[in-house]
């Protein structure tokens, strides 16, 4: 999937965690098919 950023964001961010995607893990691998 693709995400485009660089437009105004209306998502609220926690002040304690970065809103960037966490490091990839194999648990996030998409199912084949």
């Amino acid at each position: 999937s693709e995400t485009t950023t660089g437009t105004s964001s209306n998502s609220s961010q926690s002040t304690s965690n970065s809103g960037l995607a966490p490091n990839p893990t194999n648990a996030t691998t998409k199912a084949a098919g």
Epitope: G6, L20, A21, N26, T29
Partner: antibody, heavy 118, light 107 residues
């Protein structure tokens, strides 16, 4: 040790495309997002986007969305960035950089100079 | 997008001086600010992340502080190898953005 080694300098005509490679070594390539950042001559740093090496999910800067293609080949631990419909103002050094969630862009490639000239 | 404004843009100093560079964000980025050093013809090098954490191998004369919208990078005693351009970068949200840079020159 972590190393990111990029492909060599390119000279392109306006309207053409360029594809830059970034070969990673010294760490698990699939464990970190690969980012692309460019720097025009005498200018600052501009983030283009990133790719998740496992899922191939991408996040782009809106400015580049319509012209940039990011891919990867996990079998050879290499990421690619292709920029199409080149213009003279795309003349820049293009960097790949590993992004760690905690530390941000912690390791960078040496840069690839792309010159767009007729 | 979050705008980052660095000040000053240019800074002249001497070896042994203490210098401070400021980075202001257009909205709160919590602690998620990184600092990079770049020398001519070279890639940027990470110095500090999460506002104040020194990256591995970076000398302790580099110190980052701040949170929210105002951050500072302090070099306690300038060494000859410290003359370079410094960039701040927020890693709180997409799109990742950088400050315009501060060029540190020898006086």
């Amino acid at each position: 040790q972590v190393q990111l080694v990029q492909s060599g300098a390119e000279v392109k005509k306006p309207g053409a495309s360029v594809k830059v490679s970034c070969k990673a070594s010294g760490y698990d390539f699939t464990g970190y997002h690969m980012n692309w950042v460019r720097q025009a001559p005498g200018q600052g740093l501009e983030w283009m986007g990133e790719i998740n090496p496992i899922t191939s999910d991408k996040t782009f800067n809106q400015k580049f969305k319509s012209r940039v293609t990011m891919t990867r080949d996990t079998s050879i631990s290499t990421a690619y960035m292709e920029l199409s419909r080149l213009r003279s103002d795309d003349t820049a050094v293009y960097y790949c950089a590993r992004r760690d969630y905690g530390t941000s862009l912690d390791y960078w490639g040496q840069g690839t100079t792309v010159t767009v000239s007729s | 997008d979050i705008q980052l404004t660095q000040s000053p843009s240019f800074l002249s100093a001497s070896v042994g001086d203490r210098v401070t560079i400021t980075c202001r964000a257009s909205k709160s980025i919590s602690k998620y600010l990184a600092w990079y050093q770049q020398k001519p013809g070279k890639a940027p090098k990470l110095l500090i992340y999460a506002g104040s954490t020194l990256h591995s191998g970076i000398p302790s004369r580099f110190r980052g502080s701040g949170s929210g919208t105002e951050f500072t990078l302090t070099i306690s005693s300038l060494q000859p190898e410290d003359f370079a351009t410094y960039y701040c970068q927020q890693h709180n949200e997409y799109p990742i953005t950088f400050g315009q840079g501060t060029k540190l020159e020898i006086k």
